[in-house]
């Protein structure tokens, strides 16, 4: 039985150009993590594997970084970036956990009243 | 373009050990896992582990945890494989393969021709 | 570790008619936060290595003709070849793309009929 639950930091924003910690955290189970994907909907962007370590889609080398910890920093932010980001735990003897995290990338101007919602 | 180059045929002894080497050429060697995989005709394909090439980093099926030992060369983007302790069920084709991203998947993209591993006396 | 049972083992069509082949595992590949499921499917001619036909259950790799198609979701599959061709006899494998280990069907040997 699945009994634990991902904490996501939600909705977030972030400045054109910028910098963008995407982060999650497994809670509620003593289940190991075993690897952690982050995709976007139709895109893997990296894989954290508890044996392999951090491996980063070719095309996401130049703008991904790994970490802190399981996060995912994205670097040289566009417009393009806006959307739906997911962290996929996967755990024995779980199973797969996926968490939701909504980046919106704004104008430098906009950007700053909804700084609020950027992970410190 | 991409190519894995891997020798044809070992012929090794029972007992004996074996080192296979799966040259990379025509892409970034440290930006892609490699994987090995075993085929024989009584098993099928058989996934026998990964290296991270960029880390070092090693994933290995609980099978062939202490048969086989996976390791990269960076400056010859060369992985390779070493099985100890032969016996005659190792005999088998060997593949090295690449996996590549495809949209939410990494899949095995391109393999190695493989190399034919014959133990006997 | 996930169970990739393939049926038939063999199957042999007449040229021009249709060749399916089934896939299950023994758990789901279906990813439901994101809805994709982890499968792909190979192709193996004599004296080669595998090739990549299928991707996400569904997705033909570039190049592969659209007489093949993928389908199915959770933990059961399917591949048909909608008109056989005789550069189609091969082995087909079906393998679990979702967690390591990665596992593979036992392939299915298709022949002309």
């Known amino acids: 039985m699945m009994t634990g639950t991902i904490e996501t930091t939600g909705n977030i924003s972030a400045e054109k150009g910028g910098s963008i910690i995407l982060q999650c955290h497994l809670s509620s189970t003593t289940a190991q993590v075993t690897q952690v994907n982050w995709e976007q909907q139709d895109q893997l962007l990296a894989i954290c594997n508890a044996d392999l370590g951090w491996h980063i889609s070719p095309s996401f080398k130049d703008r991904v970084a790994p970490g802190p910890g399981l996060g995912l920093t994205l670097q040289s932010l566009t417009v393009n970036d806006t959307g739906e980001y997911f962290c996929i735990y996967h755990t024995y003897p779980d199973g797969t956990y996926t968490g939701r995290i909504f980046l919106e990338v704004l104008e430098s101007s906009v950007a700053e009243h909804g700084a609020r919602f950027q992970i410190p | 373009q991409v190519q894995l180059q891997q020798p044809g045929a070992e012929l090794v002894k029972p007992g004996a050990s074996v080192k296979m080497s799966c040259k990379a050429s025509g892409y970034a060697f440290t930006n892609y896992l490699m994987h090995w995989v075993k085929q024989t005709p009584g098993r099928g394909l058989e996934w026998i582990g990964a290296i991270n090439p960029g880390s070092g980093g090693t994933s290995y099926n609980q099978k062939f945890k202490g048969k086989a030992t996976l390791t990269a060369d960076k400056s010859s983007s060369t992985a390779y494989m070493q099985l100890s302790s032969l016996t005659s069920e190792d005999s088998a084709v060997y593949y090295c393969a690449r996996t590549g991203v495809y949209g939410n998947f990494l899949i095995f993209d391109y393999w190695g021709a493989g190399t034919t591993v014959t133990v006997s006396a | 570790d996930i169970v990739m049972t393939q049926s038939p083992d063999s199957l042999a069509v007449s040229l021009g008619e249709r060749a399916t082949i089934n896939c299950k595992s023994s758990q789901s590949l279906l990813n439901s936060g994101i809805q994709k499921n982890y499968l792909a499917w190979y192709q193996q001619k004599p004296g080669q290595p595998p090739k990549l036909l299928i991707y996400?259950?569904?997705t033909r790799e570039s190049g592969v003709p659209d007489r093949f198609s993928g389908s199915g979701s959770g933990t059961d599959f399917t591949l048909t070849i909608s008109s056989l061709q005789a550069e189609d006899v091969a082995v087909y494998y079906c393998?679990?793309?979702?967690?390591?280990?990665?596992?593979f069907g036992g392939g299915t040997k298709l022949e002309i009929k």
């Open positions: 393998q679990n793309d979702h967690r390591y280990p990665f596992t």
């Open positions: 996400g259950a569904s």
